[in-house]
Interface confidence: low
């Protein structure tokens, strides 16, 4: 172990901007604070002399998730009788590079509305809503990534499990399906441009069943008819 | 208010590379795309790519070939090269903001904010 | 490739008539994917219409579009002197995003 109470392991975590740095060691001898700055900027402290272990910079991040961050965290002595001062150069560990709109991980999305009609299921997926801000408004996931965003639908013959696969660059599939069948899907956030964390996790699945659909409804998911 | 400038060589021979860098001021490039469209003397608007702040680009087929359309997020400006020019890529070369906006669960693009234009001349 | 063919090539009308502009699309064009531009001489272009009909921010309630599918249409409903300059309409929906081939509204 570092003597010195050297933070490591330093990783970002972060969904849909919500953006959090942990570290390690969880001590009681050691509180720490959190320094991020871009490559242009001076450090700006963030979690002054906290006991925890990880420090919420998503406030830092949003205000341009276009550019790349650096974050260390310092290590100071926890304060107690043998302690006369904070060293004026704390020892520090750095944090790898994290640029938002590349590093941020996708969150699982929800399907928002489904109406089957005929031989066509239209299927809505729900924006979400970011922290990052423009305009003193929060922006949508769509409205961060713009054409970089794109759905995957994965669907299937209720009676049956081989998937077929649909894209959008919208937030809404339109989809030929046989009259009378019911169908399942979940769909699938993917920013294809990326080189990593292209995709999120899948969706929950909807069915078109009746059945299940009145258990949605009772649950608070609706069916929408035009 | 977001402004664009642009700037680049006027004057080419044929066969060099056009090269066009315009620069966002007043604003971020993330969440918009960022497009490059031409116009020829007396003639009408051609749409040549677009590009993302992340990279990805799109291209009009008839230039895809000889061009390249770059970001660096760090200077907050977009590029466009166009390789192996003739007299026919003369004209005004305009840099555009593709700003978002959404529609019954639709999303989908205009340009909003432009550059005043470059004026490209090929000749020998 | 989606064509956009604009009619009539110019306009000539008087201030305080009402012009009406064609942009015909060779296939079917989301009308979320259409705009409208107005160009005057040395200027880049400037956005006037989104979504077919949404007007840009700034832009006087003179200016109006409609349409839908392969036809849409830009109406002045009087014209001011600055309205008159050229007029394009753009597809961005299918790569290459394209645009008519322009109409110039004229003084009579």
């Known amino acids: 172990a570092d003597t010195t109470g050297r933070a490591y392991n330093l990783t970002w975590k972060s969904t849909n901007f919500k953006t959090i740095l942990e570290w390690e060691p969880k001590s009681i001898d050691h509180v720490y604070t959190v320094q991020i700055s871009t490559r242009l900027e001076n450090w700006k402290s963030k979690c002054f002399l906290t006991a925890e272990t990880e420090c919420d910079l998503t406030d830092e991040v949003v205000k341009d998730v276009g550019q790349t961050y650096m974050a260390r965290v310092l290590s100071y002595p926890a304060r107690n009788g043998n302690t006369t001062g904070f060293p004026e150069e704390p020892p520090f560990r750095n944090s790898p590079e994290f640029t938002p709109y590349l590093d941020t991980n996708l969150g699982q999305p929800t399907i928002q509305s489904f109406e089957q009609v005929g031989t066509k299921l239209n299927v809505t997926v729900q924006d979400a809503r970011t922290l990052v801000r423009r305009n003193g408004t929060f922006l949508s996931l769509r409205a961060v990534f713009g054409k970089d965003l794109n759905y995957t639908l994965y669907y299937w013959r209720a009676s049956s499990t081989g998937k077929k696969t649909a894209t959008t660059n919208t937030n809404e599939f339109l989809i030929d399906v046989d009259k009378g069948e019911n169908y399942c899907f979940s769909v699938q956030a993917v920013i294809p441009s990326r080189k990593r964390k292209q995709r999120s996790p899948e969706s929950l699945t909807e069915c078109t069943s009746r059945e299940q659909g009145r258990a949605r409804e009772m649950t608070g998911h609706h069916h929408h008819h035009h | 208010q977001v402004q664009l400038q642009q700037w680049g060589a006027g004057l080419l021979k044929p066969s060099e590379t056009l090269s066009l860098t315009c620069a966002v001021y007043g604003g971020s490039l993330s969440g918009y795309y960022w497009s490059w469209i031409r116009q020829p003397p007396g003639k009408g608007l051609e749409w040549i790519g677009e590009?993302?702040?992340?990279?990805?680009?799109r291209y009009n087929p008839s230039l895809k070939s000889r061009v390249t359309i770059s970001v660096d997020t760090s200077k907050n400006q977009f590029s466009l090269k166009l390789s192996s020019v003739t007299a026919a890529d003369t004209a005004v070369y305009y840099c555009?903001?593709?700003?978002?906006?959404?529609?019954?669960?639709?999303?989908?693009?205009?340009?909003?904010?432009w550059g005043k234009g470059t004026t490209v001349t090929v000749s020998s | 490739e989606i064509v956009l063919t604009q009619s009539p090539g110019t306009l000539s009308l008087s201030p305080g008539e009402r012009a009406t502009l064609s942009c015909r699309a060779s296939?079917?064009?989301?009308?979320?994917?259409l705009a409208w531009y107005q160009q005057k001489p040395g200027q880049a272009p400037r956005l006037l219409i989104y979504g077919a009909f949404s007007r840009a921010n700034g832009i006087p309630d003179r200016f109006s579009g409609s349409g839908s599918g392969t036809d849409f249409t830009l109406t002045i409903s009087r014209l001011e002197p600055e309205d008159f300059a050229v007029y394009y309409c753009?597809?961005?929906?299918?790569?290459?995003?394209?645009f008519g081939g322009g109409t110039k509204v004229e003084i009579k």
């Open positions: 753009q597809q961005a929906g299918v790569v290459p995003y394209t």
């Open positions: 555009a903001r593709d700003t978002p906006y959404y529609y019954e669960g639709g999303y989908y693009y205009y340009m909003d904010v």
């Open positions: 590009i993302g702040a992340s990279g990805s680009t």
């Open positions: 296939d079917s064009v989301d009308s979320s994917y």
